[in-house]
């Protein structure tokens, strides 16, 4: 639900800044938060036909 802060950025705002270590980018509000606050898609069972998705979380390496 990329609302609030994201909506205020405007369509032409720059790409999000990488997060500091131990934080992840919350796509839904467009800012960095503790990774544990976000819930990722359920993992695919072994042998699933579709490729594993890129994570929406973008922790700083």
């Amino acid at each position: 639900m990329r609302r609030g802060p994201r909506s205020l950025r405007g369509r032409d705002a720059p790409a999000p800044t990488p997060c500091v270590p131990a934080e992840c980018f919350d796509l839904l509000v467009a800012h960095c938060v503790a990774c544990g606050l976000l819930r990722t898609p359920r993992p695919k069972p072994a042998g699933a036909s579709s490729p594993a998705p890129r994570t929406a979380l973008q922790p700083q390496e």
């Epitope: 639900m1 990329r2 609302r3 909506s7 839904l28 819930r39 990722t40 898609p41 359920r42 929406a56």
Partner: antibody, heavy 117, light 111 residues
């Protein structure tokens, strides 16, 4: 596995306030996003709003003057309050939670509300 | 608000054949290189069930008969082959812009 369960009245009179509860098990409402969605007769789905991990709320502008979403983290429940209901609010109300892309992968079974005098 | 227009409103497909449902958005739902478009199946008396997220990623536990494609404003859900259990209403949903919106639904029946 996350489980959600809606509870509340099945009949409300026009002009009254609707109050619904979503009870969550299998995860804490202090992480993620916690939504209310409704489905009208005729099959239209409407996103109503959410409360997230920080307690931040978002409301669909079509409802903004009438809606409130709150939570009680000690009970792991969140709530919908809709004021001044009319017959147009007759619908099935769902609570649901999305993952990081906003796709809602866990839903409650829904509770059917009729607004009638 | 982003308006999602689904077509057809209903379709009847023979068992074992392909069903194709289209969803067109009134503006792009892409951001950060991701298409924020998702597909759901809903049967009577049940909540919607997530099938596809991010336009083409198959949700865990969903049969590979379901697939999604598209980007920007034009998206497609394909069911191939169609089975009896697929009779339902299918919805697209965008989570790119506030407020999130759903398509009007496509009712799938068996011919």
């Amino acid at each position: 596995e996350v489980q959600l369960q809606e509870s509340g009245p099945s009949l409300v009179k026009p002009s009254q306030t609707l109050s619904l509860t979503c009870s969550v098990t299998g995860d804490s409402i202090t992480r993620g996003y916690w939504n209310w969605i409704r489905k009208f007769p005729g099959n239209k789905l409407e996103f109503m709003g959410y409360i997230n991990y920080s307690g931040t709320t978002y409301y669909n502008p079509s409802l903004k003057s009438r809606i409130s979403i709150t939570r009680d983290t000690s009970k792991n429940q969140y709530y919908l309050q809709l004021n001044s209901v009319t017959t147009e609010d007759t619908a099935t109300y769902y609570c649901a939670t999305p993952h990081t892309y906003g796709a809602m992968d866990y839903w409650g079974q829904g509770t059917t509300l009729t607004v009638s005098a | 608000d982003i308006v999602l227009t689904q077509s057809p409103v209903s379709l009847a497909v023979s068992l074992g054949q392909r069903a194709t449902i289209s969803c067109r958005a009134s503006e792009s739902v892409d951001d950060y290189g991701i298409s924020f478009m998702h597909w759901y199946q809903q049967k009577p008396g049940q909540p919607p069930k997530l099938l596809i997220y991010r336009a083409s990623d198959l949700e865990s536990g969903i049969p590979a008969r379901f697939s999604g494609s598209g980007s920007g404003t034009d998206f497609t859900l394909t069911i191939n082959p169609v089975e009896t259990d697929d009779v339902a209403i299918y919805y697209c949903q965008q989570t790119s812009k506030d407020p999130w919106t759903f398509g009007g639904g496509t009712k799938l029946e068996i011919k």
